[in-house]
């Protein structure tokens, strides 16, 4: 996890408070008991802050510790702050705790920038606003950091979710997930919805709204209008899938799919922007420039450097294209196409010009470990992770920012020929590497 | 090589409208790499931006000008235009037209600037 | 709102010394920050962009440097027709709009 490219993002109120929300739609799927309908004790769940992460409250140790611990699909370590941190309001005390467990092994994960250190252990952990279970779960107690917690962004550890080929120092260390599963009865699925507002939301008001849900174990037909399109789960380390095919504002970005998923594709809460392969990055932001020709931002806006600035209320979001992501479908030669809005993919920024302007952030960056489909995608839908049959879901967000004139969509089926030709397979040599930092 | 030269009255009177216009030559003002702007500075004081505008139209406003101001091009005559209305003495001052250049965030070529008085 | 504070106000100095002046910035402006000279009666011109890029023409002795808050622009050994005004400009949030309150070096 690499802050300030990953770590993400402004989460906001639960609903579209700048926009609108859809119908529901009746195409619903059959019910699969269990796992669907109402999860009315973790709706809205999650609270954030711009750029900072989406976080759900949980209990660590005996008596219950209650900690903020960061949602991260991209990473499978479940760590906590557990030593004083200038950044931290609290941390995890082992000794105060009589169900912790040395496990005397350490662990340390460097990233590009930063990196965090702790001590292995395990402990009963319980989610207050999840499924009313308690589990032994591995935790990596974390006594040293660097540019790891952020200052102001109110969690103190984070959870890893994705699997444990990715988990550190090894994949022997069972996550948080998996060891829920195999505790409980809880099915092996989860599901996220992030709202972003759509505006930047100040300190005071991150505490007092509401930034999303996190649903274990099911889904939540309040979360998500029209119907829930699958993806294969290519490969269960990262939540990595296939894409197909890009087009921006309709128009295909023609470029030989295996570019698009060059080195992998992976679903990431834990990224704020959506990240792109350089090539594609490159045709990306030249197609978005084309489209918004009428006016022209400064090279450093298209760098995710620069803000560009607004009348309060003026941004020209119909001169900014749609994003459109074909994503493999379930059946043999088909796909389905997620897209997004600009409301999506400029993210707002706060405390940096007047109070009558509108300033944002382009987060849409390049990558040189493959696509991220972070915050920027998410927050546009309803995304399940359904690890009991290895794929991902996506349903337009009922919380999602848009328009009167657009929404975010997801769409199918489409007739895709040749689609496992787009998975790039990474030379075995090359995976130590990748897994040291995600620049 | 490319110049601007602003024009205009030289004395307008309180709740007047001051019209300035900005000449291009040497250069086209329909080049894709620039944005053109205008930026004042009263007598012994500093410089205040005041707006700016794409050959295609787009204009962004000072926001404590806004309500007063108004940005114009008018490609075919290479020449960009200033409107500021309801105008004050506190309005007096050098009015300077500019072009935003490298990477359009900084002005990088600038006209000689006119004296402007708000005046009875 | 991001704004520039220029240090000091004014810099008494002779020909041949060095000058340092300072900008600070209300909050990080990454390295999106120009440096203007401005003589009496002209046009202000582009010195330094980009916190420490010369813009064409602009002799060696003028330097620029910083990123985030911090910034300085040093001039090795002060010429003659270097006393002047000198402003520093903010491009982080475009477009750009916030300028200093200007540091006037004059002669001693």
């Known amino acids: 996890t690499q802050h300030g490219i990953r770590l993400p993002l402004r989460s906001g109120l639960g609903g579209a408070p700048l926009g609108l929300r859809l119908p529901r739609e009746t195409d619903e799927e059959p019910e699969e008991p269990g796992r669907r309908g109402s999860f009315v004790e973790m709706v809205d769940n999650l609270r954030g802050k711009s750029g900072q992460g989406y976080y759900v409250e949980m209990t660590v140790g005996s008596p219950p510790q209650t900690l903020n611990i960061l949602v991260d699909t991209g990473s499978s370590n479940f760590a906590v702050g557990a030593a004083p941190h200038p950044f931290l309001h609290r941390y995890y005390q082992r000794q105060l705790s009589s169900t912790y467990r040395d496990l005397r092994k350490g662990v340390y994960v460097p990233y590009t920038q930063g990196k965090w250190e702790g001590e292995l252990g395990t402990d009963l952990v319980s989610i207050p606003h999840g499924p009313n279970v308690t589990v032994r779960a591995n935790i990596a107690a974390i006594t040293e950091s660097d540019k790891f917690f952020i200052n102001g962004s109110n969690w103190e550890g984070i959870l890893g979710l994705a699997y444990a080929e990715i988990a550190r120092p090894d994949d022997s260390l069972e996550p948080f997930f998996d060891s829920l599963v195999k505790q409980t009865h809880v099915p092996n699925l989860f599901s996220l919805q992030l709202c972003g507002a759509g505006f930047p939301l100040n300190q005071s008001e991150v505490l007092a709204s509401v930034g999303g849900s996190m649903i274990i174990g099911g889904i939540d037909h309040s979360l998500y209008t029209g119907s829930l399109w699958y993806t294969p789960i290519r490969r269960e380390w990262y939540y990595e899938v296939i894409i197909v095919r890009v087009e921006i504002n309709g128009q295909d970005l023609k470029m030989d799919c295996k570019e698009y998923n060059y080195d992998k594709s992976i679903v990431d809460s834990g990224t704020t922007n959506l990240r792109l392969p350089k090539k594609v990055f490159e045709a990306a932001v030249k197609s978005i420039k084309a489209a918004s020709s009428t006016e022209k931002f400064p090279d450093g806006f298209w760098l995710g450097e620069q803000l560009v600035c607004w009348q309060a209320g003026t941004t020209p979001w119909n001169i900014f294209p749609v994003i459109s992501l074909y994503l493999m479908g379930e059946v043999t030669n088909q796909s389905f196409r997620i897209t997004i809005l600009p409301q999506q993919y400029l993210r707002p920024v706060e405390d940096v010009a007047t109070s009558q302007d509108d300033c944002y952030k382009f987060a849409i960056s390049q990558s040189s470990t493959g696509t991220v489909m972070g915050a920027v995608i998410m927050e546009g839908f309803y995304v399940v992770f359904d690890r009991a049959r290895k794929r991902i879901g996506f349903a337009v967000s009922a919380c999602h920012v848009h328009d009167e004139f657009r929404t975010a969509a997801v769409e199918g089926p489409f007739v895709t020929l040749d689609m496992e030709d787009c998975g790039y397979n990474i030379p075995q040599t090359d995976e130590s590497t990748l897994m040291t930092g995600r620049a | 090589q490319l110049q601007l030269q602003e024009s205009g009255p030289g004395l307008v009177k309180p709740s007047e409208t001051l019209s300035l216009t900005c000449t291009v030559s040497g250069g086209s003002i329909s080049s894709s790499s620039y944005y053109w702007g205008w930026i004042r500075q009263p007598p012994g004081k500093g410089l205040e931006w005041i707006g700016s505008?794409?050959?295609?139209?787009?204009?962004y406003y000072n926001p404590s000008l806004k309500s007063r101001v108004t940005i114009s091009v008018d490609t075919s005559k290479n020449q960009f235009s200033l409107k500021l209305s309801s105008v004050t003495a506190a309005d007096t001052a050098v009015y300077y037209c500019?072009?935003?250049?490298?990477?359009?965030?900084?002005?990088?070529?600038w006209g000689r600037g006119t004296l402007v008085t708000v005046s009875s | 709102e991001i704004v520039l504070t220029q240090s000091p106000a004014t810099l008494s100095l002779s020909p041949g010394e060095r000058a340092t002046l300072s900008c600070r910035a209300s909050q990080s402006v990454s390295s999106y920050l120009a440096w203007y000279q401005q003589k009496p009666g002209q046009a202000p011109r582009l010195l330094i962009y980009d916190a420490s890029n010369r813009a064409t023409g602009i002799p060696a002795r003028f330097s620029g440097s910083g990123s985030g808050t911090d910034f300085t622009l040093t001039i090795s050994s002060l010429e003659p027709e270097d006393f002047a005004v000198y402003y520093c400009q903010q491009a982080y949030v475009w477009p750009p709009r916030t300028f200093g309150g200007g540091t006037k070096v004059e002669i001693k």
């Open positions: 500019a072009r935003v250049g490298h990477g359009i965030s900084y002005f990088d070529l």
């Open positions: 505008i794409y050959y295609s139209g787009s204009t």
